[in-house]
């Protein structure tokens, strides 16, 4: 079974950094990912950036660069404007959609007692959708 | 719950111009659609696809507008906009703005997997 992992990580330098972390891990190619926050795309989540293979990448603050660190794996940063850090307390999804098979989410989010420039661990919670 | 609101309808002349915008908004989030498409009724007429664009920016067009109508999205990617250029009567109609998302983030066939509806802002091309 296809499954997505997510990963939640806060810069060391900058604790207003953040990266997140997405991966695929089954067969099949990827035809769009989206990340979102807040909760699952479309059911109450923000898309913060939505990566295609061909068309590029559209992403919006407070996301700051998102790109692809493999042909099924990709990776977002952002940039906390605030004084407080709400990253800390936020859920990223991650959905991947392999187009015809279907589509795979997962969400994360930065442990509480995370040291900064330590990631924390994949936590898949795959979220089955037959788009 | 996600609510189309649409906008700029009214009478213009032969030859005129006119721009229609659609806010997409939601409860407790904000909502981004891969697509955006504006559809148009006719008085006693079906409903006609008139264009559509994806969150990449792609668009697609009917051929009884293409050249006169230009679709376009703000970068937030959550308001759609009609810019319709050298109206004629034709163009009367209803103009409906829906949304909804695809498998791989492009504009379906226009009308298929959009399950969210404005509920329109009339448009009425008369000297």
């Known amino acids: 079974t296809p499954e997505v992992w997510v990963q939640v990580q806060m810069e060391a330098t900058e604790l207003s950094s953040f990266t997140v972390h997405c991966g695929f891990l089954g067969p099949g190619s990827i035809s769009l990912v989206t990340v979102s926050w807040g909760g699952p795309d479309g059911a109450g989540g923000t898309k913060l950036a939505v990566l295609h293979p061909e068309l590029g990448t559209r992403q919006w603050a407070p996301a700051r660069q998102a790109r692809w660190e493999t042909q099924s794996s990709i990776s977002l940063a952002l940039e906390d404007s605030g004084a407080s850090s709400p990253f800390a307390n936020t859920t990223f999804c991650c959905k991947f959609a392999s187009f015809p098979e279907g589509s795979w989410e997962s969400c994360g989010s930065l442990p509480p007692s995370s040291d900064p420039g330590l990631s924390a661990p994949p936590t898949p919670v795959p979220i089955l959708r037959a788009d | 719950h996600v609510q189309l609101v649409e906008s700029g309808g009214g009478l213009v002349q032969p030859g005129g111009s006119l721009r229609l915008s659609c806010v997409a908004s939601a409860s407790g989030f904000t909502y981004r659609p891969y697509c955006m498409a504006w559809f148009r009724q006719a008085p006693g007429k079906g409903l006609e696809a008139v264009a559509g664009?994806?969150?990449?920016?792609?668009?697609t067009y009917a051929d009884s507008v293409k050249g006169r109508f230009t679709a376009s999205r703000d970068n937030a990617g959550f308001s759609l906009y009609l810019q319709m250029n050298s109206l004629r009567a034709e163009d009367t109609a209803v103009y409906y703005c829906?949304?909804?998302?695809?498998?791989?983030?492009?504009?379906?066939?226009?009308?298929?997997?959009?399950?969210?509806w404005g509920q329109g802002t009339m448009v009425t091309v008369s000297s």
């Open positions: 664009i994806d969150i990449f920016g792609g668009t």
């Open positions: 829906a949304a909804g998302d695809s498998p791989d983030g492009r504009c379906p066939p226009l009308g298929q997997g959009l399950n969210y």
